[in-house]
Interface confidence: low
């Protein structure tokens, strides 16, 4: 807690400059007024502080708004968020995308912090929905983002969302966020013609039922090795040989590398030998 | 370090046919999907044909669709796109160009071959 | 298709200015969008992909913002290298399409 002195004679602040630089932390607290400090907050970022004097502003700020600082500051508080905890943001409401983004901005190149991930909560249920422009902002910044959503918020995920999903951002999804996410994928490319579509629908395909894989290997989808073995084994396994290598194309070979992993192993397992013959591959059910 | 080295570009009269390669190294080819994009003398840039890390999947842009043919042999890192038919307006120079790890995207450019479609 | 409108096609400026190019979709695009540089007689250069993330090796004065159908590259210092055509590419959907492109000339 910083002691409360008087402002020494002609040291009150005018206006928030770099001279506040060689303010010590008792000098700061006596002599910036919290209101000018909240109307200037974009000029505080555009002075080298230090951590210490940083402290002091944001305390001051703390006691001009106790409730929480109003979406004006927090849009310009650039790296004195890296001082907020958790339970000063819960107390925040931000609405705009151009405040998250500045605050995302701060934090880039970083891991997700708590801090990060409560702004993150808070501006989503604020919003009651994960929109598309969100998305994008969010995966921007954090490519694993949708991945660390649980299968119940990814629910709340609108189709119109899944055009701003890139490949990479469902690297990390397990296969109940890809059960999820997949038929909001299929809703949201369903317009698109048949290659465009598998282009889009591949990194979603690890929520495919069979029928679907079914209906994809009468399109010469050529799907790659890597793609297939991140396919449902319970979706896998009805397929028959024939619809496997119509699926596959020409990368139907690369079953022969993966023969002892699954879903390879398994569907093997469940094909006639007269049927894997017909691959001439060598395959052993 | 990533080189493309374009080949096969120009002279040839209308209504002829050239086939241009694309020579890649310093990179895993068969990794990354490719792309051709041409710009005419004194234009800007236009995106011609795109293909899939194992050839199965090709774009076209429609100005070319129906006389354009992009392929790739990725056991000699190399791009392909054979160009029947050609016209006055095809003649640009050439480029292949890398899709980068952002879907879309081109990271890495060759230097370009000049394609001249003229009687 | 989708089309891409730049502005200016055109501008001058001078060594240590700051520089803004704009670029508009025809339809949204999220955030697929790339730009690229190219100076006479050479190949581009990728600078930006993802609207505002910068590729490997790009100096940090070349950003990039913005979303939907609403895009800017920023050349925050502007140096003699930088004189150069700038494109910008959405990647949303096939076919791929660029700008018309942004010459950006010595004062």
């Known amino acids: 807690e910083v002691e409360k002195t008087a402002c020494p004679s002609g040291k009150k602040a005018r206006e928030i400059d770099e001279s506040l630089i060689f303010y010590k932390k008792w000098e700061l607290e006596a002599c910036v007024d919290a209101a000018l400090l909240a109307t200037q907050m974009d000029r505080v970022n555009a002075i080298p502080f230090t951590y210490e004097q940083l402290d002091v502003l944001k305390h001051k700020l703390d006691e001009l708004y106790p409730q929480g600082y109003p979406e004006s500051v927090i849009q310009h508080l650039g790296y004195l968020f890296l001082k907020m905890s958790p339970e000063d943001i819960r107390k925040w409401n931000v609405t705009s995308l151009e405040t998250l983004k500045a605050l995302l901005e701060v934090n880039k190149g970083h891991e997700m912090s708590p801090q990060v991930a409560t702004l993150i909560d808070r501006f989503v249920k604020g919003r009651g929905q994960l929109d598309k422009d969100t998305l994008d902002t969010l995966t921007a910044f954090y490519p694993g983002y949708l991945c660390s959503l649980s299968p119940e918020e990814l629910s709340s995920v609108p189709p119109s969302s899944i055009w701003a999903v890139r490949p990479q951002d469902l690297d990390t999804c397990d296969p109940r966020q890809l059960d999820v996410l997949y038929p909001k994928a299929r809703l949201a490319f369903q317009n698109m013609n048949g290659s465009e579509y598998f282009v889009k629908i591949q990194s979603f395909l690890g929520g495919a039922p069979t029928e679907d894989l079914k209906a994809l290997s009468q399109q010469n989808v050529s799907m790659d090795l890597a793609t297939f073995m991140k396919l449902r084994t319970d979706a896998v396994l009805p397929l028959t040989v024939a619809e496997v290598q119509k699926l596959l194309g020409p990368h139907v070979e690369g079953l022969k590398a993966e023969e002892r992993h699954r879903p390879v192993r398994d569907w093997i397992l469940r094909q006639r030998q007269d049927d894997l013959d017909t691959l001439g591959l060598g395959l052993q059910g | 370090e990533v080189q493309l080295l374009e080949s096969g570009g120009g002279l040839v009269q209308p209504g002829g046919s050239l086939r241009l390669s694309c020579a890649a190294s310093?990179?895993?080819?068969?990794?990354?999907?490719m792309t051709w994009v041409r710009q005419a003398p004194g234009k800007g840039l236009e995106w011609v044909s795109g293909?899939?890390?194992?050839?199965?999947?090709?774009y076209y842009a429609s100005s070319v669709k129906g006389r354009f043919t992009i392929s790739r042999d990725n056991s000699k890192n190399t791009l392909y796109l054979q160009m029947n038919s050609l016209r006055a307006e095809d003649t640009a120079v050439y480029y292949c160009a890398k899709r980068g790890a952002a879907v879309g995207s081109f990271d890495y450019w060759g230097q370009g071959t000049l394609v001249t479609v003229s009687s | 298709d989708i089309q891409m409108t730049q502005s200016p096609s055109s501008l001058s400026a001078s060594v240590g200015d700051r520089v803004t190019i704009t670029c508009r979709s025809s339809q949204g695009i999220g955030s697929w969008l790339a730009w690229y540089q190219q100076k006479p007689e050479k190949a581009p250069q990728s600078l930006i992909y993802?609207?505002?993330s910068l590729q490997s090796g790009v100096p940090s004065r070349f950003s990039g913002s913005g979303s939907g159908t609403d895009f800017t590259l920023t050349i925050s210092n502007l140096q003699p290298e930088d004189f150069a055509t700038y494109y910008c590419?959405?990647?949303?959907?096939?076919?791929?399409?660029f700008g018309g492109g942004t010459k950006v000339e010595i004062k």
């Open positions: 590419q959405q990647y949303n959907s096939y076919p791929l399409t």
């Open positions: 993802a609207a505002s």
């Open positions: 310093g990179l895993t080819f068969r990794s990354y999907a």
């Open positions: 293909i899939s890390v194992s050839g199965g999947i090709t």
